[in-house]
């Protein structure tokens, strides 16, 4: 996880630590290098990459995808719907790098470090949106029931929801960075 | 034709006032931070500060902070920017600029105000 | 703060030469910048996130470099490019700018 700098905060309501949005912005370009790690592997391991098949694993996730109405789009953008929006995204993705904890061989420690800074980003995230309403965490038996689902899978179906999951934080974060830079 | 006009500059005495407008015109307004950078009399460029799309966040440079107040009113496509405590070394052209969305480049940029600030 | 320190402070050339201005952080940059001024106007982007052209830049421009170093090259300095250029970089906030190299016509 890239180093924390000390926030230099200024007095009045609303005005941002100088620093924060460095962190942030700097955060998910590392997760996002992870994730190109992690794709290697995947992609390198099993043709999951070239699939046509997605929609028959695609059934059984329910992946955090950005949409118009969740205003992180240059067209129809709300610099706080969008930031409740990327925070419940990324609770919503812990569950699935959760589950990819163990789909890696030789990038362990790289999924590891993905999950470990998806969590410090969801926690700078939230001092962003200290003013925002209350954020709703997903329930932990809903998640508890859907990991043992997941891991239950065939090996095909394992190889192609970590492809999958892969793909969609991916494209979750580069929304998300985009959005991010405007606010 | 996208473009961004300031007024509002002038003449104005030490530990004055005065309060500047960029006018957008051209472009969706409401996705765009927007930012201040200034130019003091043959010197070169400093920016001032930034305003989120919708108001919510604002940064500020250290030798601004609680002079200045950044705002915006989307109805009217116009960003402000509040001077209070003015000082001598305050007096610069004032541009407005447009960050790019997705990026942290100011891509558009208004033609200027004249602030000097002089008893 | 992050420093920009560029060089040359100013420059002669002629028409179709190569120019090339650096720009020196005083630590690691998270992106750079490149603009050009003419007298009495204001800067217009030219290169974004180090290497990329801006809307509508004529392709002699181009941005390099990562870390601390970058450059600003014309590979053929055209009579409309005689201007003061400023590099300007992010890395949280502030944003800060190079003190200006001014090309002047040899």
């Known amino acids: 996880v890239p180093p924390g700098e000390d926030s230099k905060d200024v007095a009045a309501p609303h005005r941002q630590p100088l620093t924060s949005s460095e962190r942030i912005d700097k955060q998910i370009r590392y997760i996002l290098d992870g994730i190109s790690a992690l794709r290697k592997e995947t992609c390198n391991k099993s043709n999951m990459c070239e699939s046509s098949k997605e929609a028959l694993a695609e059934n059984n996730l329910n992946l955090p995808k950005m949409a118009e109405k969740d205003g992180c789009f240059q067209s129809g953008f709300n610099e706080e719907t969008c930031l409740v929006k990327i925070i419940t995204g990324l609770l919503e993705f812990e569950v699935y790098l959760e589950y990819l904890q163990n789909r890696f061989e030789s990038s362990e420690e790289q999924a590891r470090a993905v999950q470990m800074s998806t969590k410090v980003l969801i926690q700078f995230l939230q001092k962003k949106a200290k003013n925002l309403d209350a954020i709703t965490t997903p329930d932990p038996t809903t998640n508890a029931s859907l990991l043992t689902k997941l891991q239950a899978q065939n090996q095909w179906l394992q190889d192609m929801t970590t492809h999958l999951i892969l793909r969609s934080f991916k494209e979750f974060l580069q929304s998300s960075l985009r959005a991010l830079r405007q606010m | 034709e996208v473009q961004l006009v300031e007024s509002g500059g002038g003449l104005v005495q030490p530990g004055g006032s005065l309060r500047l407008s960029c006018a957008a015109s051209g472009f969706t307004f409401s996705p765009f931070a927007m930012h201040w950078v200034r130019q003091a009399p043959g010197k070169g460029l400093e920016w001032v500060a930034k305003i989120s799309p919708g108001g919510s966040w604002t940064y500020y440079s250290d030798t601004v902070t609680d002079r200045f107040t950044f705002s915006l009113d989307t109805s009217k496509s116009t960003a402000y920017l509040q001077m209070n405590s003015l000082r001598a070394e305050d007096t610069a052209v004032y541009y407005c600029?447009?960050?790019?969305?997705?990026?942290?480049?100011?891509?558009?940029w208004g033609q200027g105000t004249l602030v000097t600030v002089s008893s | 703060d992050i420093q920009l320190t560029q060089s040359p402070s100013s420059l002669s050339a002629s028409v179709g030469d190569r120019v090339t201005i650096t720009c020196s952080a005083s630590i690691s940059v998270s992106y750079m910048y490149w603009y050009q001024q003419k007298p009495g106007k204001a800067p217009k982007l030219l290169i974004y996130d180090m290497s990329n052209l801006a809307s509508g830049v004529p392709s002699r421009f181009s941005g390099s470099g990562s870390g601390t170093d970058f450059t600003l090259t014309i590979s053929s300095l055209q009579p409309e490019d005689f201007a003061t250029y400023y590099c300007?970089?992010?890395?949280?906030?502030?944003?800060?700018f190079g003190q200006g190299t001014k090309v002047e016509i040899k």
């Open positions: 600029a447009r960050q790019k969305w997705g990026y942290y480049a100011l891509d558009i």
């Open positions: 300007m970089q992010w890395s949280g906030y502030p944003y800060t």
